[in-house]
């Protein structure tokens, strides 16, 4: 047989035995001559070296470039390929020689007392056990142990080839520790060398350190690091650790295999590094490496060792947090410390507890921030070992987009008497205060809510053409007053007023307020009527359980058929303050009311009386009158607000105070409630009587004690009472110093 590429100038070496396969008996002599056209060499089986004493290669006597290979007394192990080749080329001629040795039918490798076969557990893979034969047509089976199993060639996936060995699917022998080939010759059994079966997996999936990060200790504490490697089945693992202080006396390493569930396709290995008493030199990077030979996977973690327990705030700790009403606010407590500190939050000195609106932990979270959340928050960190404390104050400022108070108070459908001067007001509450409040207007008929026009809840006016109030052409003459600032319900508000000099035209007015976090607007329907007029007796805003009368007055010569109605539920869910007028066109939404008619010389007066007004009586009341001549209906609408009865409350605390004789004390007691409560002062539970030194002002809200004397010392009580009860606050005034003797004494 010839091997190699044909050369232009060289013919293949020529062998004296012109066969691919030669079969000879053991103990005979093998002699092959090789001739060629340049220097030749021989290669033979097993160690294929020129150092084998039994093999003799000699130059031929009858010519150049000729070599004869001789092996006297051949044995089975001489079976194999004999190759003659030109030096430095691939050109070669090969003959395969079988040395039939029935006492040793398998060729043994010189270096092998036993062999190794690597296999992978894979249904599709086959493995070759290299038990080559010195006889080509042997009857060979494969024995595997333990338990003992025999595999016989099946003409398919199990086969034996004398030049190659025994081929078998690897999974069939993956259980075995060792295998060998066996040949039967004349009822005699012959065995090959033993082959150790090594099942080899490949992949290391991952290496995980536990704890994985944020490991902090103080000097003397114990460090325990677990390193887990997850691998394919049949993978072996060497663990290796790298750490800062390699010369550690107290270091302990334990490696073990972890149990995995049966049927699992995975193996787990664990290596545990323990350092009993860490020192500062143990601080640093700890790396665990898992090595299988075919792969390496590593993972690292940083271990921080502190000299002693400590606590401090991190540099990123905020001092000012700004938020808008309704937002979620998160204030993290950024700290450095070991061990992790206990964290406590306070607001204006009062401890905060977690509930559904606020979570006070590592992060202070206010779910939906409101104005009342404005204030100073103190976070106190306490080291659990040393009890060292650190505190930090965070100011929370809650911004409020502009809110217009009248939006919910003033009726959308109030009517205004023709020719009168009217003042429209927008009272704006915003934090920070609005940087501007602008007024706009447009004619009512340009913005009538016709059924044909699409009206949405968010935009109930189908009109867009708002005009600046400076341009009042075709409308009412307007003047915008300078903004006023007022303390209303304890809040600083901005009041913008627009004066309509003469109510001649029905129009819509809009005020728009803007600050840094948003905008607010209010649309006022300014419906001008020449019809009846409504007044309230005795008060603009009654309190519940009080009585009120709504008077509708109309000129008897112009109008007839005066009727009181109450505006019923809206057909559309339209926002308060956003329904254009008039209502006369749609009487379906009106509820007729009982009323009493009175007359004087010029007017008819229709009085609708509400005894013991309740909150349910609130709403829009319509007085309808008919023009005697044209029969046209005229409507006037008035919104009635009934104030809820509220028990007295006192805002703010009276503070205990110490004053020196001769100084003055000034304290105030602000009470709210409906009906408004009466304020009284007591000293040591006795009614406080005004005299030259004791002054009560502003409906007893403010108490002044001038030139205090020792006898002014005592318990002072402010009490606010109404029909709904009383509220009180107390404070103790201490007077220091000696009483001076007067001349009178």
């Amino acid at each position: 047989a010839s091997v190699g590429l044909p050369s232009v100038s060289l013919d293949l070496p020529r062998l004296s035995i012109q066969k691919d396969i030669l079969t000879i008996k053991a103990n005979t002599t093998l002699q092959i001559t090789c001739r060629g056209q340049r220097d030749l060499d021989w290669l033979w089986p097993n160690n294929q070296s020129g150092s084998e004493q039994r093999v003799e290669v000699t130059e031929c006597s009858d010519g150049l470039f000729c070599k004869t290979l001789t092996i006297p007394k051949v044995i089975g192990n001489d079976t194999g390929a004999y190759k003659c080749f030109y030096r430095e080329t691939d050109l070669a001629s090969v003959i395969y020689v079988y040395v039939q040795d029935y006492r040793s039918p398998f060729i043994a490798s010189v270096s092998d007392q036993h062999g190794v076969v690597y296999i992978t557990e894979n249904k599709n893979k086959t493995v070759v056990i290299p038990c080559l034969g010195s006889i080509s047509n042997l009857n060979v089976s494969l024995c595997a142990r333990y338990p003992e199993k025999r595999f016989v060639p099946d003409g398919n996936r199990i086969s034996w080839d004398s030049k190659k060995g025994f081929t078998i699917p690897s999974y069939m022998i993956s259980y075995a520790g060792m295998v060998f080939c066996e040949a039967k010759i004349n009822d005699e059994s012959y065995q090959s060398i033993m082959y150790i079966v090594v099942v080899v997996g490949y992949r290391i999936y991952d290496v995980v350190l536990s704890p994985s990060h944020g490991i902090e200790l103080s000097v003397g504490e114990k460090l325990v690091l677990n390193c887990t490697a997850r691998t394919e089945l049949n993978v072996g693992i060497d663990f290796n650790w790298e750490y800062p202080s390699s010369k550690h006396q107290h270091k302990k390493l334990v490696n073990r295999d972890l149990k995995t569930q049966s049927g699992s396709e995975m193996k787990k290995f664990l290596s545990t590094l323990t350092i009993d008493g860490v020192t500062r030199s143990d601080q640093g990077l700890y790396t665990c490496a898992a090595s299988s030979g075919l792969m390496t996977k590593k993972n690292s973690t940083f271990v921080r060792v502190h000299e002693k327990p400590f606590v401090a705030f991190g540099s990123g700790m905020e001092s000012l947090v700004e938020a808008t009403v309704g937002e979620r606010v998160r204030i993290p407590a950024k700290y450095l410390g070991y061990p992790p500190p206990e964290i406590k939050w306070y607001k204006n000195g009062i401890p905060l507890e977690s509930n559904h609106t606020i979570k006070a932990g590592h992060v202070l979270t206010i779910m939906e921030v409101s104005e009342r959340d404005t204030g100073n928050y103190t976070v106190i960190l306490t080291n659990p070992i040393s009890k060292e404390k650190q505190s930090h104050v965070v100011s929370l400022v809650v911004y409020v987009p502009p809110q217009i108070g009248e939006k919910s108070l003033i009726s959308p459908v109030d009517s205004y008497q023709y020719g009168t001067t009217q003042t429209l007001t927008c009272t704006v509450y915003a934090i920070p205060p609005p940087h501007h409040i602008h007024w706009y207007w447009q004619l009512e008929e340009e913005c009538a809510n016709e059924p044909s026009q699409a009206v949405s809840v968010t935009n109930p006016y189908p009109c867009e053409e708002w005009r600046s109030v400076e341009d009042f052409q075709g409308g009412n003459k307007i003047e915008v007053n300078k903004n006023q600032f007022a303390l209303i319900e304890g809040k600083n508000k901005t009041v913008s007023t627009l004066v309509i000099q003469a109510a001649n035209v029905s129009a819509l007015y809009k005020c728009e307020a803007v600050n840094k976090v948003g905008r607010g607007e209010r649309v006022i329907s300014f419906h001008v009527t020449r019809g009846p007029e409504i007044t309230l007796q005795p008060d603009m805003q009654p309190t519940e359980q009080e009585s009120v009368s709504l008077w509708c007055t109309a000129d008897r010569s112009t109008f007839e058929n005066l009727t009181w109605y109450k505006l019923g539920p809206q057909p559309l869910p339209i926002h308060v303050g956003e329904l254009p007028t008039p209502v006369c066109k749609n009487l379906d939404t009106l509820w007729k009311l009982n009323a009493t008619m009175f007359s004087n010389s010029t007017n008819d007066i229709l009085i609708m009386e509400l005894k013991n007004a309740s909150l349910q009586d609130q709403g829009d009341y319509v007085c309808l009158a008919q023009d005697r001549k044209t029969k046209k209906r005229h409507c006037v609408v008035r919104q009635l607000t009934v104030l809820e009865r509220v028990a007295p409350t006192i805002t703010g605390n009276l503070e205990n105070q110490t004053t020196s004789i001769g100084e003055s004390i000034e304290v105030s007691c602000t009470a709210s409630g409906n009906p408004p409560p009466q304020i009284m002062w007591f000293k040591d539970n006795e009614t406080l009587v005004e005299d030259s030194g004791i002054v009560l002002k502003d409906g007893n809200r403010n108490l002044t004690i001038r030139r205090v004397r020792k006898e002014d010392e005592g318990l002072y009580t402010c009490q606010a009472c109404s029909v709904l009860g009383c509220a009180k606050v107390e404070a103790f005034f201490i007077i220091e110093g000696a009483q001076e003797k007067t001349n009178l004494e």
Partner: antibody, heavy 116, light 107 residues
Framework: EVQLVQSGGGLVKPGGSLRLSCAAS????????MNWVRQAPGKGLEWVSA????????YYADSVKGRFTISRDNAKNSLYLQMNSLRAEDTAVYYC?????????WGQGTLVTVSS | DIQMTQSPSSVSASVGDRVTITCRAS??????LTWYQQKPGKAPKLLIV???SLQSGVPSRFSGSGSGTDFTLTISSLQPEDFATYYC?????????FGGGTKVDIK
């Protein structure tokens, strides 16, 4: 700098022996699996042998099994390949390689020529 | 052993060309495929692991894709320094085996 520097190649007769060395620097040698890969002249790459970090697990290609021995000395940051009973078909450039998920760092290679 | 077959065995291309090399495994290897670049007289250099993860420092014009048995290495715009031989290697089952290589040379 992470590197592997090889030595020990050369010409050897069929049946002869040779020992290749690979010196590691710039990384923690004792943590890594190491491998030998060879490349016959003008041919592709062939994996030869592997050894785990503490030498507990050793593997060989069928073509070299029983003739080649891989070893390492972590104290000297060195990897070795002892090659016995060399054959003409062992002629190749031998590379040592560090292995992570793949052969990520290679030596410069050393040529082994087996010829009489 | 798992056989890895690369195609083509060589490709001639110009600077700026898009070059695609394929590698096929004789059985499924999931995504455990690695690509190497080798220049004449030099050791191979790792380019891509797990079929598509670019090794740090490797230009983004190199990309890998595929899973199971069929894999691709793409050079989006060939640069002068990319002329080399490229090898794939499976890392799924023992022993590790390489493809025969694909030589990318100048047209």
């Amino acid at each position: 700098e992470v590197q592997l520097v090889q030595s020990g190649g050369g010409l050897v007769k069929p049946g002869g022996s040779l020992r290749l060395s690979c010196a590691a620097s710039g990384f923690t040698f004792s943590s890594y699996s190491m491998n030998w890969v060879r490349q016959a002249p003008g041919k592709g790459l062939e994996w030869v042998s592997a050894i785990s970090s503490s030498s507990s697990y050793i593997y060989y290609a069928d073509s070299v099994k029983g003739r080649f021995t891989i070893s390492r000395d972590n104290a000297k940051n060195s990897l070795y390949l002892q090659m016995n009973s060399l054959r003409a078909e062992d002629t190749a450039v031998y590379y040592c390689a560090r292995v992570t998920d793949a052969f990520d760092i290679w030596g410069q290679g050393t040529l082994v020529t087996v010829s009489s | 052993d798992i056989q890895m077959t690369q195609s083509p065995s060589s490709v001639s291309a110009s600077v700026g060309d898009r070059v695609t090399i394929t590698c096929r495994a004789s059985q499924g290897i999931d995504n455990w495929l690695t690509w190497y670049q080798q220049k004449p007289g030099k050791a191979p250099k790792l380019l891509i692991v797990e079929a598509s993860s670019l090794q740090s420092g490797v230009p983004s014009r190199f990309s890998g894709s595929g899973s199971g048995t069929d894999f691709t290495l793409t050079i989006s715009s060939l640069q002068p320094e990319d002329f080399a031989t490229y090898y794939c290697q499976q890392a799924k089952a023992f022993p590790p085996t390489f493809g025969g290589g694909t030589k990318v040379d100048i047209k």
